[in-house]
Amino acid sequence: FERTRSLQDPCSNCPAGTFCDNNRNQICSPCPPNSFSSAGGQRTCDICRQCKGVFRTRKECSSTSNAECDCTPGFHCLGAGCSMCEQDCKQGQELTKKGCKDCCFGTFNDQKRGICRPWTNCSLDGKSVLVNGTKERDVVCGPSPADLSPGASSVTPPAPAREPGHSPQ
């Protein structure tokens, strides 16, 4: 162990991965297993997070950094640092207090998490529905009905044809 000699705070010499032991004349003692200190000059070590149950270990704890957890398959992380795991649902569903429920007509969810959201209202943008929505997909809005009047084309005009005898550049 390192005995520190700083004139100001002797603990400031204790590196990450150790704690400054007030009861032992400011000796820098290593953090015990399953604990860490991420900065120097600490008087305590933090107990490592344990990824148990529905949590699984994404990164092991070390003497200088905490463990990081994620969720087992079928669950996803919620909250800062994956503080909670929430059950996945299928696309086209949302999680309620009673479990996964299909999206109501007029709503969709294209992910395994989150809530069902209303289909886009194409008419608000003066457009028409090109592809109908489903429980899993939003509607696809197309050109406005006015753009589809006779003589108007929503299709990009073809590129001009090359002159015969000319090869591509």
Epitope: F19, N22, P32, R43, T44, I47
Partner: nanobody, 120 residues
Framework: EVQLVESGGGLVQPGGSLRLSCAAS????????VGWFRQAPGKEREYVGT??????HYGDFENNRFTISRDNAKNTVYLQMNNLRPEDTAVYYC???????????????QGQGTQVTVSS
Amino acid sequence: EVQLVESGGGLVQPGGSLRLSCAASGRTFDNYAVGWFRQAPGKEREYVGTYWSGYAHYGDFENNRFTISRDNAKNTVYLQMNNLRPEDTAVYYCAISLKYPMATVTPDYQGQGTQVTVSS
């Protein structure tokens, strides 16, 4: 709600021994360091020691007379006190924290304490 319950205190003669127990309900000790503190009448609370992951850290007064250990199966932490002196008379508290050691720490939870009296 976490509850810590200390037991094993009592009256003992100088030079005698006691083993205090700290049991947790509502949560296991798995994720926590467990500490012991004591408070004598009219005095400030004094740090006794902390146990975590097979390691124990002790206050500077106990001179190897006190030993902290843990029984995982019983979810109980013990404070073995040998060669007791009258100045060890105090209420002994068990506490848990996410910090090791707990010498400079306010615990997350603390029990109600158990009285230890050393007298002839």
